[in-house]
């Protein structure tokens, strides 16, 4: 028999240093926890003490903190050869600056190869792309030789912005071929590594002949055997098994996000390269795992570009930002327009002639904005300045609801109207009419939603029955601020771009804005 | 376990070339930096230079640029110190060791050291 | 190139006593939050062997009694019970800046 321990990582996104619990900015760096230095530190002591080890990460390195917005990927390409990754594979979030923001920061600079067997590039893009990317790997571990074969979410064109010359396949139609490829290379370990999500992880794991285990991202799955050690909750075991179509027992794994854990797999093959044996458990790096001083003084050297950043112009404002709590909880406010229109904006993608764009629709809680912005500071809009006014760190999302879904949203945004809560809603691409005579529960009169099927954009009566794409926070994804019909009913969850980037992005490319307060939310007359 | 198993001693002489050895072991080769040092008779020890195994690239001390090369082999996990001249002042203990791929990580484990003695 | 100077050039210590050897750099390797001053153990017919790095980090395997301190240019490593087995030459290393440069080091002695 031959043991493997297979450490990966997933979802990372851009949190290079140590954050809070809940993966935001750390405050307590004593209850701190994740961060490439801690990171190093476990990877190293664990390569230290077993022979076979490979460190994989299963794509979304892209895209979270404002380390990504100034670094723009070349601090994902630095860290990761610090850490001697043996493996990635490409997430959606990899594209999030286009083709050309993948392949210079990071393809061309990665000291390990980057996997994708369902990503077929075209045109022009060919030649340029050829070999930066790869459809497997053979890797020798020992005296053993391991494939890697790399997959990524088909759903990229809609989540990010890849262009018009890659083609995303179905994952499972274009691993089969390479996994044969494998095999007829006598090679007889088989490792699938992508970002498509727990759900195609396992159908991977069921469908593909010849993967033996599969490391997965996208879905943000925490799997766990026994007491977990945090907040998460388990999806599953860790691994989760699955029995293949012919008859194989696969173990399928991910790691939650933001490097808060280490998976740790460990595999046992027999000599034919059959999984004989498969054990292991999330580690969470938390703060009893010191940070390496030589991870940790390059990233205190490279922070410092960031703390210049933050101070710098965006763009101007020349009118007041108005993200008060006595506005944004009670009714339509500009500074929740603007965060709306900046979400519509982020998620432009022209995949389909019959289609204007594949959403628009915007929903956001009044409580998620915390800050003003004066426009009497020169106008001037810095990070700094976004940072006051999202301060949480989250992201925002696509997701697919039923119309009769969106509207318990919005009965539930003014069920307890005018006691300044979070859940009242801010909008875009929806004009909705409230009747607080009435009762709670019954209180929309009139939603109106845009049209994405259609040449000209107009506004229509929402239907209960069709389905719809909506971006909002991450926040109300997970069923905050009591919004747990989200939650519960959604049909789809495709995690997004960070909020303050999305906006900071928006506003830079405007240059000067002037958003108005102009009919989005309106209250039925006598009511208000 | 980690081992870096270094050739045996060399007796030349001024002139002749040299190539001394490195094989690794119990780790992934290319993981990790490979450095050289040497170590004069009764002195203290030298850095001369390294070499990234993943890709070939190498960083020498300007003390010993153009004077020795590093290369490594990936397939045979083998790094490698040559001379194409040597001379009497080269007699010395030459050490390989290992290091993480980030300029300020330490020497985290040594090769036994191969002894070259340069005499007419 | 960074100077790098150990005192004493030897020191004989009775066992179970402290062993204290200093290094001084001829410039500060404190480098980002952190001092890069490495220390090796070397015996006789052996290769070094990493003690500590970063100035006060233990590495792999290293017993509690031997500890590290100091930052900018002024370090010491500390033996607070000196063992038969100690006997050695100790030496401080910079990872600041290649290249990478080393004190003449310290014979330790047992008394």
């Known amino acids: 028999a031959w043991e493997l321990t297979i450490l990966h990582t997933n979802d990372v996104h851009s949190r290079l240093e140590q954050t809070s619990e809940d993966s935001s900015k750390c405050v307590n760096a004593s209850r701190c926890m994740g961060g490439v230095a801690r990171l190093f530190t476990k990877v190293q002591q664990i390569r230290r003490a077993e022979p076979n080890v490979l460190l994989l990460d299963a794509g979304d390195q892209y895209q979270g903190t404002i380390w990504f917005t100034v670094y723009k990927g070349a601090e994902v390409a630095h860290f990761m050869n610090a850490l001697r990754y043996d493996a990635m594979a490409l997430g959606n979030h990899e594209f999030d600056n286009g083709v050309e923001g993948l392949i210079e920061p990071l393809l061309k600079e990665a000291k390990f190869p980057i996997l994708s067997a369902n990503i077929k590039a075209k045109g022009p893009l060919a030649s340029q792309i050829s070999g930066l990317y790869l459809p497997y790997k053979v890797l020798p571990v020992g005296d053993e030789v391991v494939g890697i074969v790399g997959y990524t979410s088909k759903e990229t064109p809609f989540l990010s912005n890849p262009g018009t010359n890659l083609v995303f396949e179905d994952e499972i139609t274009a691993l089969q071929p390479e996994v044969d490829k494998l095999k007829t290379l006598n090679v007889n370990k088989i490792i699938a590594l992508g970002h498509s999500g727990f759900e195609m992880d396992k159908l991977i794991a069921q469908k593909v002949r010849g993967v033996d285990v599969v490391v997965g991202g996208h879905s943000n799955t925490f799997l766990y055997t026994g007491n977990p050690p945090s907040k998460e909750v388990p999806a599953g075991k860790y691994p989760f098994i699955v029995t293949s179509d012919d008859g194989r027992k696969v173990p399928v794994v991910q790691a939650y996000a933001f490097g808060k854990y280490l998976g740790y797999l460990k595999i046992e093959f027999d000599e034919r390269g059959n999984v004989i044996s498969s054990h292991g458990n999330p580690i969470l790096l938390n703060s009893s795992i010191p940070e390496d001083p030589s991870i940790k003084a390059d990233i205190n050297k490279w922070r410092i570009k960031l703390d210049n950043y933050s101070t710098q112009e965006l763009g101007k404002t020349i009118v007041y930002l108005d993200g008060s709590s006595q506005s944004c909880r009670f009714r339509e406010c500009n500074m929740g327009n603007l965060i709306c229109d900046a979400m519509i904006n982020n998620n432009l993608r022209h995949t389909d002639e019959m289609f204007w764009n594949h959403v628009s629709m915007c929903i956001l809680n009044g409580g998620g904005i915390r800050s003003p912005i004066d426009e009497r500071n020169n106008g001037t809009i810095t990070w700094e300045n976004l940072a006051a006014v999202l301060p949480f760190g989250g992201t925002f999302d696509l997701v697919q609801l039923k119309g009769s879904t969106l509207k318990k949203a919005f009965e539930h945004s003014v069920h307890r109207y005018g006691q300044s809560t979070g859940e009242f809603l801010q909008v875009g691409g929806i004009h909705v009419v409230y009747d607080l005579s009435r009762k709670p529960g019954d209180r929309v009169v009139k939603l109106d939603v845009l049209c994405t099927k259609c040449r000209v954009p107009s506004y229509d009566p929402l239907k209960m029955d069709e389905v719809y794409k909506v971006i909002l926070p991450n926040f109300l994804a997970n069923g905050g601020d009591g919004f747990q019909m989200i939650k519960d009913e959604l049909l789809r969850h495709d995690s997004g771009d960070q909020d303050i980037n999305v906006v900071s992005t928006y506003i830079s490319k405007m240059k000067v804005i002037y958003p108005a307060v102009e009919g989005r939310i309106k209250f039925s007359t006598g009511s208000h | 376990e980690v081992q870096l198993v270094q050739s045996g001693a060399e007796v030349k002489k001024p002139g002749e070339s040299l190539k001394i050895s490195c094989k690794a072991s119990?780790?992934?080769?290319?993981?990790?930096?490979m450095n050289w040092l040497r170590q004069m008779p009764d002195k203290g020890l030298e850095w001369m230079g390294r070499i990234d195994p993943y890709d070939s690239e190498t960083h020498y001390s300007q003390k010993f640029k153009d004077k020795v090369t590093i290369t490594a082999h990936k397939s045979s996990s083998t790094a490698y110190l040559q001379w194409s001249s040597l001379k009497a002042s080269d007699s010395a203990i030459y050490y390989c060791?290992?290091?993480?791929?980030?300029?300020?990580?330490?020497?985290?484990?040594w090769g036994q050291g191969t002894t070259v003695t340069v005499s007419s | 190139d960074i100077v790098m100077t150990q005192s004493p050039a030897s020191l004989a210590v009775s066992l179970g006593e402290r062993a204290t050897i200093s290094c001084r750099a001829s410039e500060s390797v404190d480098y980002y939050g952190f001092s890069f001053m490495n220390w090796y153990q070397q015996k006789p017919g052996q290769p070094p062997k990493l003690l500590i790095y970063a100035a006060s980090t233990q590495g792999s395997g290293v017993p509690d009694r031997f500890s590290g301190s100091g930052s900018g240019t002024d370090f010491t490593l500390t033996i607070s019970s000196l063992q038969a087995e100690d006997v050695a030459v100790y030496y401080c290393?910079?990872?600041?800046?290649?290249?990478?440069?080393f004190g003449g080091g310290t014979k330790v002695e047992i008394k």
């Open positions: 290393q910079q990872s600041k800046e290649v290249p990478y440069t």
């Open positions: 060791a290992r290091s993480s791929p980030i300029t300020t990580a330490p020497f985290d484990y």
């Open positions: 119990g780790y992934t080769f290319t993981g990790y930096w």
